[in-house]
Amino acid sequence: EEELQVIQPDKSVLVAAGETATLRCTATSLIPVGPIQWFRGAGPGRELIYNQKEGHFPRVTTVSDLTKRNNMDFSIRIGNITPADAGTYYCVKFRKGSPDDVEFKSGAGTELSVRAKPSAPVVSGPAARATPQHTVSFTCESHGFSPRDITLKWFKNGNELSDFQTNVDPVGESVSYSIHSTAKVVLTREDVHSQVICEVAHVTLQGDPLRGTANLSETIRVPPTLEVTQQPVRAENQVNVTCQVRKFYPQRLQLTWLENGNVSRTETASTVTENKDGTYNWMSWLLVNVSAHRDDVKLTCQVEHDGQPAVSKSHDLKVSAHPKEQGSNTAAENTGSNERN
């Protein structure tokens, strides 16, 4: 007569995270009396998953009614699978015994592999802004995926980047994995509207990769170019000097006028115009009463952009040809004017 056999027909089972795993097991006999138990792993450290005899196993349901007479199907379903459930599951027949049931025969085991989707990639850029022609690093991270095989690509405005390094951790076997990649990007003056994209492809995503983005507007600083020009005389003793601040980003900018090195007026860029490339232009003017000056006047437009050291541009105003007028103002209010490039 043949002794009871425990049959686990599936060598492996693959389940997506969040779904239900069915682990199949049948016995060839009702003899001996005693429960079936399911374990994850083997040896003394094995984890009890289900015991037909006793206990509470809220995630486990039996496929068939084990109270039914002549039942020899001991298959179970485990709900809400997570990567932590991965492992080899054994269906084990015990023989009723005192004081404890005795292990009688084990099935060959079923390896449960869990397919888990990667988390949405998170792209982060440098802590400080950088200027065009500089190389900056972006990192991309995604976690919690299984199996380990994964593909990561970097793009800048749709163009694939090649200068990046990627690591998948851990190197050995694990219930789930993480990916970390660092890409190097050379900034250009046109990058205010640019995007860096990290794209992750995994078997669980069915060909629809996940993307994480970073806007270079949060990384780039485009310093302004300055031009100071003298406008035609508006009145007999007045000269209009303009300072055109072009192609800067971000908008945070403070402009100071100096007359012969002395501060005349300070103002903050407000009504700016935006260029197609995302940079800004701004213009400030100074109305100089030349009759108040005996000598030539050196006018300086000094700009402090985004907390960086000030840049300036000067203009020499010739006053020798103009008669002097005592006590008159040397500067008039500026009225904002804009120029679009």
């Epitope: 007569e1 002794e3 009702l30 003899i31 001996p32 009396v33 084990l66 007479r69 039942n71």
Partner: antibody, heavy 115, light 111 residues
Framework: RQLVESGGGLVQPGGSLRLSCAAS????????ISWVRQAPGKGLEYIGT?????ITYYASWAKGRFTGSKTSSTAYLQMTSLRAEDTAVYYC????????????WGQGTLVTVSS | DIVMTQSPSSLSASVGDRVTITCQAS????????LAWYQQKPGQAPKLLIY???TLATGVPSRFSGSGSGTDFTLTISSLQPEDFATYYC???????????FGQGTKVEIK
């Protein structure tokens, strides 16, 4: 589906008897066969269960004098050193208890131990 | 060995009555549910009614029900029928596979 016992009868004290339990309609290979007896006018008494070769067990009082065996179609109970108090109707039943209860029973065979 | 004590040993009841028979084990039965109930009529073999303390055997009328766990168990016949007059036995299993013991029986007679 039924079990049919045979082999009962009159036996002298100290004698031996072999009871048979033939299954029809199902195989015994995946089932235990248990033996239960009932003395005249008394209650039921569990004797033991015959499973596969190594899985055979008996109530403490029956060990040594009662031994069982089975094929895929017939189970046997060998009884030795019989005593007057062994007089009873002997039943075979399919099952091993717990989740494998005694669901099919034979009609019983009377064993009388008397000189 | 496990000892099963049934009560009452006999009872008289009428058709339509609700009948309750109890069975007490000297120790917890195996798995807290290794308890079956059998019905036996004169000159016949026993018949399985309930197993695993509360599972109704195939073909058994639903007026029979079993309950209990550990050491105390009950067989209830919700509405006694003429064919239910018989002797009822509980069978309890201890932790050892050979430790199976019947109660002494409860005879249900017509009042």
């Amino acid at each position: 589906r039924q079990l049919v016992e045979s082999g009962g009868g009159l036996v002298q004290p100290g004698g031996s008897l072999r009871l048979s339990c033939a299954a029809s309609g199902f195989s015994l290979s995946s089932h235990g066969i248990s033996w239960v007896r009932q003395a005249p006018g008394k209650g039921l008494e569990y004797i033991g269960t015959i499973g596969t070769g190594v899985i055979t067990y008996y109530a403490s009082w029956a060990k040594g004098r009662f031994t069982g065996s089975k094929t895929s179609s017939t189970a046997y109970l060998q009884m030795t050193s019989l005593r007057a108090e062994d007089t009873a109707v002997y039943y075979c039943a399919r099952g091993s208890a717990w989740n494998d209860p005694f669901d099919y029973w034979g009609q019983g065979t009377l064993v009388t131990v008397s000189s | 060995d496990i000892v099963m004590t049934q009560s009452p040993s006999s009872l008289s009841a009428s058709v339509g009555d609700r009948v309750t028979i109890t069975c007490q084990a000297s120790q917890s039965v195996y798995g807290n549910n290794d308890l079956a109930w059998y019905q036996q009529k004169p000159g016949q073999a026993p018949k399985l009614l309930i197993y695993l303390a509360s599972t109704l055997a195939t073909g058994v009328p639903s007026r029979f029900s079993g309950s209990g766990s550990g050491t105390d168990f009950t067989l209830t016949i919700s509405s006694l029928q003429p064919e239910d007059f018989a002797t009822y036995y509980c069978l309890g299993g201890g932790d050892d596979e050979a430790d199976n013991t019947f109660g002494q029986g409860t005879k249900v007679e017509i009042k």
